[in-house]
């Protein structure tokens, strides 16, 4: 039950996670103007990873694209890569973690294989959360580095007389939305990995270990880590009675690699 | 077609206030800012403020700060602008003007103005 | 605040002349977001109201004669009238619409000689 609560748990997590990290790749406001200057301004600025916008005080607001492609700074292109990289992850990782699901069932899919597809998605959501909040990050230190530069040479013009003043940007709403959702994307992630150690053993087919005994020989079937921690329902882990003599050295075992997870 | 139209011109003492309107019709009230400008006889322009009608969020030029009180009335689509502690620098004729959308912040509809005399 | 100087302060002239003012700011009225110029003319014929003739530095209102033309950009802005007529004897106002708090220039009159 309890593995079955995480699974879900950590599936609802990582939706909500990859879900914000498309809403902030989308988003217009990765960098606003600074109104430390000027907080009341007729012209208020903003940017975002495809666009750069402007709105006017009548409420109008106009767009444009970024209509070039080897123009962009490298930086830009690599948060973009970075945000995409994570979104097709993330989407990926929902896809396999939908089937993945213990509360659904699909034919007769085998409980191991559950178990990796769950272990598989969790990853996949690892690293679709720090790809967001690498991009978040790089587009931040960008944007730092930027308003210092432009602090610096915050007013040009000819003897003082003429002020040109550069527009400085401040980190937007989007900034934010993508670093909370790259960590719900990753929390979600590892809820996930953990989700998977308690299914694997309970997926996993054992091969019953005989011990030699003088009357009859009764062979235990390990539960194994789901035994010991008491997750759902240990229903596999029964006495089977066998009339055969088998040495321990005759009988193979197969463990899963989850086991030592 | 966009109208705006102002209240009649107002004689005042030192000291008191008056309350002036503009009466917006032909477009929707709340979809424009509603600025005021005052006008010193033979002098320039000087920006009062402005008001938000949806929001009646004000804002004031530093100068006016306490002079001027700017508000809205939704229901009647009138914009009013009370002026108090009266003195002769009040003497001018004040406008209201919408701000244009799509007009780079500029003002394409304005008020035919309301002159006000202060005089003891 | 952003000072907008306007010269000349008068203009005598002729009907069917050829007229330019110029305004200029103390501060680009250029903003970088878009490129776009934050500047607009009025014409105030005497006893009336302004009224909006160029806006964006370079944009003409609707039901503006086409003998009225704006140019300029970041700090430096022109005022044109191709061909002046009788109507057109009026103050002539630039005003800046990037900053708060808006300004004006204390305008250009136009006179017939």
């Known amino acids: 039950m309890a593995v079955t609560a995480c699974q879900g748990l950590g599936f609802v997590v990582s939706l909500i996670g990859i879900a914000g990290i498309i809403a902030a790749t989308c988003m217009d406001q990765w960098s606003t103007q600074d109104l430390y200057n000027n907080p009341v301004t007729a012209v208020f600025n903003y940017q975002g990873l495809w666009r750069s916008c402007v709105r006017e005080s009548s409420g109008f607001t106009e767009c444009r694209g970024y209509f070039t492609l080897l123009g962009l700074p490298a930086m830009l292109q690599a948060v973009r890569a970075l945000m995409i990289v994570g979104i097709v992850l993330g989407a990926i990782g929902l896809l396999v973690s939908i089937f993945a699901l213990k509360c659904i069932r699909i034919g007769s899919m085998e409980d191991s294989a559950k178990a990796n597809m769950t272990l598989t998605s969790g990853i996949m959501f690892i690293v679709s959360g720090l790809c967001a909040i690498a991009g978040v990050s790089v587009f931040a230190n960008m944007l730092v580095t930027n308003f210092w530069m432009s602090t610096a040479n915050m007013y040009t013009g000819m003897g003082g007389m003429v002020q040109t003043v550069q527009t400085r940007y401040t980190f937007g709403a989007a900034l934010f939305v993508g670093w909370v959702a790259g960590g719900l994307t990753l929390i979600g992630g590892v809820m996930m990995c953990i989700a998977c150690r308690g299914l694997a053993p309970e997926e996993t087919n054992y091969k019953a270990v005989s011990y030699h005994a003088s009357g009859h020989s009764v062979a235990y079937k390990p539960g194994g880590f789901k035994a010991s921690t008491g997750f759902g329902s240990n229903t596999k882990n029964k006495k089977i009675y066998d009339g055969g003599a088998r040495t321990e050295d005759e009988v193979q075992s197969y463990p899963s690699k989850h086991d030592y997870v | 077609q966009v109208q705006l139209q102002q209240s009649g011109a107002e004689l005042a003492k030192p000291g008191a206030s008056v309350k002036m309107s503009c009466r917006a019709s032909?477009?929707?009230?709340?979809?424009?800012?509603m600025h005021w400008i005052k006008q010193r006889p033979g002098q320039a322009l000087e920006w009062i403020g402005y008001?938000?009608?949806?929001?009646?969020?004000?804002e004031y030029n530093q100068k006016f700060k306490g002079k001027a009180t700017l508000t809205a009335d939704k229901s009647s689509s009138t914009a009013y602008m009370q002026l108090s502690s009266l003195t002769s620098e009040d003497s001018a004729v004040y406008y209201c003007?919408?701000?244009?959308?799509?007009?780079?912040?500029?003002?394409?509809?304005w008020g035919q103005g309301t002159s006000v005399t202060v005089s003891s | 605040d952003i000072v907008m100087t306007q010269s000349p302060s008068s203009l005598s002239v002729s009907a069917g002349e050829k007229v330019t003012m110029s305004c200029k700011s103390s501060?680009?009225?250029?903003?970088?977001?878009?490129?776009?110029?934050?500047l607009a003319w009025y014409q105030q014929k005497p006893g009336q109201p302004p009224k909006l003739l160029i806006y964006?530095?370079?944009t003409r209102e609707s039901g503006v004669p086409d003998r009225f033309t704006g140019s300029g950009s970041g700090t430096d802005f022109t005022l044109t009238i191709s061909s002046v007529q009788a109507e057109d004897l009026a103050v002539y106002y630039c005003?800046?619409?990037?900053?708060?708090?808006?300004?004006f220039g204390a305008g250009t009159k136009l006179e017939l000689k």
């Open positions: 003007g919408r701000l244009g959308y799509y007009k780079r912040n500029a003002m394409d509809h």
């Open positions: 032909g477009y929707t009230f709340t979809s424009y800012l």
């Open positions: 008001i938000n009608p949806t929001t009646d969020y004000t």
């Open positions: 501060q680009s009225l250029l903003n970088s977001g878009n490129q776009k110029n934050y």
């Open positions: 964006g530095a370079s």
């Open positions: 005003q800046n619409d990037h900053f708060y708090p808006l300004t």
